[in-house]
C-alpha cells in the first residue's frame, strides 16, 4: 500500500468575519494508526486547533463523521471567524506513540484570510476655529478591517479633495488594519454650511462605501464687518447712530458703545438674523442727546466676537453751532435704544 499522503487541496480560503471557515483535508490511506490534528502556524509555536484524539474544541466541527473507519476526509469547520483566526492551517497525521504521538506527515497548509469590515469612519476637525483663507486639517480614522487593501477619498460639498495624506497600519502582515488620513482644507467665507466627507471603500462593503462627515461650521470663524451710520431723526436734539454687524459666525458676540472713549453701553447679541450662507447679522443703535454735548462726539462701536480681540468702528457725530449755543452744561447719559433686527443681506 502506498504511503499515506495528506492533501490540503486549497492553498488559500477567504471568509467574512462572523462566518464559518471550512478547511479541507484528505488522507490517501488509513495507515499508520494514529490521530490527525489541525494546527495554525508551523514550528514550535504552532497552535493546536483540533485534536481528533482528545480535547474540547467548541468552535470546531468535523465535516465528515470521523468515527467511520473508511472515512478519509478530515476537513474541519471553524465557526464565528474573527480576524484573529487568520493564518496558515496545517492538517497533520500522527502515528500512535509514546511518550508522545509522532508526527508522520503534514499537509501543505491552507492560508485563511479573514475579510473584516472597517469600522464607521470617524472624522474630527481642528481643536480651534480658523478664519477664511486659512487652511485647517481634518482627520479620518477607521479600524479593524482586513484585507489591507482599502481606498479612502475626501470630499468637500461633493467635490473631491486632493490635498490629503493617508496611512494604513501596520505596514506588515496583521490580523486587521487601521487607516488614518489627514486632509487639508482651505476655508472660505461661505463654508459655514459646508461639509467634509471621508469615504472608505473596501472589498467587504460590496460597493457601498462607508462615510464619515464633519461640519465646517465647527471649524470656521467668520469675523464680522462693522458699519456705523447716522439715521435721520425728527427731533432736532437727538441723533440715532446704528452699528450694523454683518456676516459673522459663530453667534457669540458682545457689542460695546463708547462715547469719546467712555463706555456707554454693553450688550450681548441675542436676536440674530441668519443669512443664507449661515452667517449672522445684527444691528444695534444708540440715541444720543445732542444738547448734552458742546463739542463733536466720537461714537465707537466695539465688537468682541467668539472670544477674539475686539474690532471697532468709529463715527464722528457733529454738533451744530445752534445746538452748541443752546446746549447745557449738564451731560445727560446717552439713551440706548432697544435693538432691532436689520434685514438679512442674503
Amino acid at each position: 500500500e502506498d504511503e499515506l499522503q495528506v492533501i490540503q487541496p486549497e492553498k488559500s480560503v477567504s471568509v467574512a468575519a462572523g462566518e464559518s471557515a471550512t478547511l479541507r483535508c484528505a488522507m490517501t490511506s488509513l495507515i499508520p494508526v494514529g490521530p490527525i490534528m489541525w494546527f495554525r502556524g508551523a514550528g514550535a509555536g504552532r497552535e493546536l486547533i483540533y485534536n481528533q484524539k482528545e480535547g474540547h474544541f467548541p468552535r470546531v466541527t468535523t465535516v465528515s463523521e470521523l468515527t467511520k473507519r473508511n472515512n478519509l476526509d478530515f476537513s474541519i469547520s471553524i465557526s464565528n471567524i474573527t480576524p484573529a483566526d487568520a493564518g496558515t492551517y496545517y492538517c497533520v497525521k500522527f502515528r500512535k506513540g509514546s511518550p508522545d504521538d509522532v508526527e508522520f506527515k503534514s499537509g501543505a497548509g491552507t492560508e485563511l484570510s479573514v475579510r473584516a469590515k472597517p469600522s464607521a469612519p470617524v472624522v474630527s476637525g481642528p481643536a480651534v476655529r480658523a478664519t477664511p483663507e486659512h487652511t485647517v486639517s481634518f482627520t479620518c480614522e477607521s479600524h479593524g478591517f482586513s484585507p489591507r487593501d482599502i481606498t479612502l477619498k475626501w470630499f468637500k460639498n461633493g467635490n473631491e479633495l486632493s490635498d490629503f495624506q493617508t496611512n494604513v497600519d501596520p505596514a506588515g502582515d496583521s490580523v486587521s488594519y487601521s487607516i488614518h488620513s489627514t486632509a487639508r482644507v482651505v476655508l472660505t467665507r461661505g463654508d459655514v454650511h459646508s461639509q467634509v466627507i471621508c469615504e472608505i471603500a473596501h472589498i467587504t462593503l460590496q460597493g457601498d462605501p462607508l462615510r464619515g462627515t464633519a461640519n465646517l461650521s465647527e471649524a470656521i470663524r467668520v469675523p464680522p464687518t462693522l458699519e456705523v451710520t447716522q439715521q435721520p431723526m425728527r427731533a432736532e436734539n437727538q441723533a440715532n447712530v446704528t452699528c450694523q454687524v454683518s456676516n459673522f459666525y459663530p453667534r457669540g458676540l458682545q457689542l460695546t458703545w463708547l462715547e469719546n472713549g467712555n463706555v456707554s453701553r454693553t450688550e450681548t447679541a441675542s436676536t440674530l438674523i441668519e443669512n443664507k450662507d449661515g452667517t449672522y447679522n445684527w444691528m444695534s443703535w444708540l440715541l444720543v442727546n445732542t444738547c448734552a454735548h458742546r463739542d463733536d462726539v466720537v461714537l465707537t462701536c466695539q465688537v468682541e466676537h467668539d472670544g477674539q480681540q475686539a474690532v471697532s468702528k468709529s463715527y464722528a457725530l457733529e454738533i451744530s453751532a445752534h445746538q452748541k449755543e443752546h446746549g447745557s452744561d449738564i451731560t445727560h447719559e446717552a439713551a440706548l435704544a432697544p435693538t432691532a433686527p436689520l434685514g438679512g443681506s442674503g
Epitope: L30, V33, G34, P35, K53, L66, G97
Partner: antibody, heavy 118, light 107 residues
Framework: EVQLVESGGGLVQPGGSLRLSCAAS????????MHWVRQATGKGLEWVSA???????YYTGSVKGRFTISRENAKNSLYLQMNSLRAGDTAVYYC????????????WGQGTMVTVSS | DIQMTQSPSSLSASVGDRVTITCRAS??????AAWFQQKPGKAPKSLIY???SLHSGVPSKFSGSGSGTDFTLTISSLQPEDFATYYC?????????FGQGTKLEIK
Amino acid sequence: EVQLVESGGGLVQPGGSLRLSCAASGFTLSSYDMHWVRQATGKGLEWVSAIGTAGDTYYTGSVKGRFTISRENAKNSLYLQMNSLRAGDTAVYYCVRGGVWDDAFDIWGQGTMVTVSS
Amino acid sequence: DIQMTQSPSSLSASVGDRVTITCRASQGINNYAAWFQQKPGKAPKSLIYTASSLHSGVPSKFSGSGSGTDFTLTISSLQPEDFATYYCQQYVSYPYTFGQGTKLEIK
C-alpha cells in the same frame, strides 16, 4: 447493527489444530484493525493477535509461529488458525474490532471456547 | 513488553459509593489506556479509550484520567449493575497488554 460472531471452538488434543472464525456484520471488516483476545477460566484477559488494514499481522510471544491470523474480505470474516495447540491455550477466544483511528477496542464478540486436553 | 499493574485486585463497596481503580504502566504509554467492564460469563464491554474518552452509550458516571504511566477509572455513584471485574489495557504498542483485573464486589 454492528456485530461480531465467533465460531469454531471446541475440544482438541494437545498438538492438534483448530480454526476459529469471526463473522462481521454491520461494517466492513477490512477497514478495521481486528484482534483476537483470550481469557482462561477464572483468569484475566490476554491479547493474542491482530491484523491491520494493510494485512500486517502481530502476535503475542507465546503463540508466534503456531497461530496465524487472516481475513477473507469477500466473506467479511476474520480467522485464527491455531496449530500445535497446548493446554495453556485453553480459553474463551474473543474477536474484537479496533477503533477508528487509534485501534482502541470497541466491539467484542460473544466468544468461543477452546479446550486443549487429552 | 509493557506491564500494566492494577490496584486493588478486589474492592468491596456499597451502592451509591464513589470508587476509584488505578492502573500503572511499566513505561509511558502516552494516553493510550483503555478500561473494560466484564460480568461473569459475558464478553468484556468497552468503557473508556485514550484514558478519558467514553465509548458511545457508556454512562457519564464512568470517568477516566491520566497520562504517561498512571491512570484511574472512577465510578461516581455505584449502582447494582456496576458490580463486575474491571480491566485496564495499554494499546500504544504491540503486544497490547491488560492489567490483571479489579473485582468490584458488593459490601
